[in-house]
């Protein structure tokens, strides 16, 4: 496949990455496989800088992002460590909080209404993100 | 305008089986979880069941869970309740009511509209 | 299950005064993602419920501004600055931090 060198139409582009911004609830699942078709993943937050930028974007609004430990650790969907990269919990987050009756705990992690993280259950339908980066080789045949 | 209209309430004798149903309209369905909510005459609301926007997960209150079954169809809008095993107790005007507030960019897990509502009497 | 216990049951209010109506919940109703669930319904006669207040403290969209929500945690209020005739009817407090949602036993209102 062919580098992708800008960002498909109606997505941001912002350091090297674009950026789609849902106005639609789906559950964790759902908005993951929502990216995973359109060639990309829910976002990866590594730094301070790309967390003020989707906060931008996003508003004040519960919002999927592309972290969960539906396996036991934390894991980020496209393998960056989480052990050693950036994080922004809100206070006593993550719990794992059993109370909601909705069965399990809680497993999936999103943008709260100040941009900082909780984990929730996964199948409540929260907005997403997408994130792609520019410098992968997409799954599209090269012009000739 | 958003509207829900309930249909399907009477009266039934105690063991017997009946099915409501709710049109939508005015919103996108397929976005929002949906709601059964009951009221005995002169008394306060019960919530009955919810489902979830694409149907995946439903939950039940302990009163009813085993004997009714909550269901949508988003190609038509529509949202049901079959109750089967009524007993007295279940005698009561049943509410369909849309979850999920939209205001301004967000979805709150409240319940913002109701509809009016359709009368069970379950008696011999 | 969480139980919602509103009280005044009944209140008779003479049209223009304030009332205020409490909802006590028996669990925290603060979330992870530091809203807190409580919601407030008017139920006028022979009408279903309408919503007043969602998350504490929240106006809905035409609801008129003598409503307000205030508390925390456990214990909620809702306020009428200047009761009107059309204010009567049946008012509920909700939590949906979690399943079953409930509701509290009502608070009729009348006009004296």
């Known amino acids: 496949g062919s580098e992708r060198t800008c960002c498909p139409v109606n997505w941001v582009e912002h350091e090297r990455s674009c950026y789609w911004f849902s106005r639609s609830g789906k559950a964790w699942a759902d908005a993951d496989n929502y990216c995973r078709l359109e060639d990309a993943h829910l976002v990866v937050v590594t730094s301070w800088e790309e967390q003020k930028f989707v906060q931008h974007h996003i508003g004040p609004v519960n919002t999927w992002m592309g972290l969960h430990d539906q396996n036991g650790p934390w894991k980020w969907v496209d393998g960056t460590d989480y052990e050693t990269g950036f994080k922004n919990w809100r206070p006593e987050q993550p719990d794992d909080w059993y109370g909601h009756g909705l069965g399990g705990g809680e497993d999936c992690a999103h943008f709260t209404d100040d941009g900082r993280w909780n984990d929730d259950v996964c199948q409540r339908p929260y907005r997403w993100v997408c994130e792609t980066e520019l410098d992968k080789a997409s799954q599209e045949p090269p012009l000739l | 305008q958003v509207q829900l209209v309930e249909s399907g309430g009477g009266v039934v004798q105690p063991g017997r089986s009946l099915r409501l149903s709710c049109a939508a309209s005015?919103?996108?369905?397929?976005?929002?979880?949906m709601h059964w909510v009951r009221q005995a005459p002169g008394k306060g609301l019960e919530w009955v069941a919810v489902i979830w926007y694409d149907g995946s997960y439903k939950y039940y209150a302990d009163s009813v869970k085993g004997r009714f079954t909550i269901s949508r169809d988003n190609s038509k809008n529509t949202l049901d309740l079959q109750m089967n095993s009524l007993r007295a107790e279940d005698t009561a005007v049943y509410y369909c009511?849309?979850?999920?507030?939209?205001?301004?960019?967000?979805?709150?897990?409240?319940?913002?509209?109701w509809g009016q509502g359709t009368t069970v009497t379950v008696s011999s | 299950d969480i139980v919602m216990t509103q009280t005044p049951l009944s209140l008779s209010v003479t049209p223009g005064q304030p009332a205020s109506i409490s909802c006590k919940s028996s669990?925290?109703?603060?979330?992870?993602?530091?809203?807190?669930?409580l919601y407030w319904y008017l139920q006028k006669p022979g009408q279903p419920p309408q919503l007043l207040i969602y998350e504490v403290s929240n106006r809905f969209s035409g609801v008129p501004d003598r409503f307000s929500g205030s508390g925390s945690g456990t214990d909620f209020t809702l306020k009428i600055s200047r009761v009107e005739a059309e204010d009567v009817g049946l008012y509920h407090c909700m939590q949906s931090i979690q399943l079953p949602w409930t509701f509290g036993q009502g608070t009729k209102v009348e006009i004296k």
């Open positions: 005015g919103f996108t369905f397929s976005s929002y979880g």
């Open positions: 669990q925290s109703l603060l979330h992870g993602d530091g809203k807190t669930y």
């Open positions: 009511v849309k979850m999920g507030i939209e205001v301004a960019v967000d979805y709150y897990y409240g319940m913002d509209v």
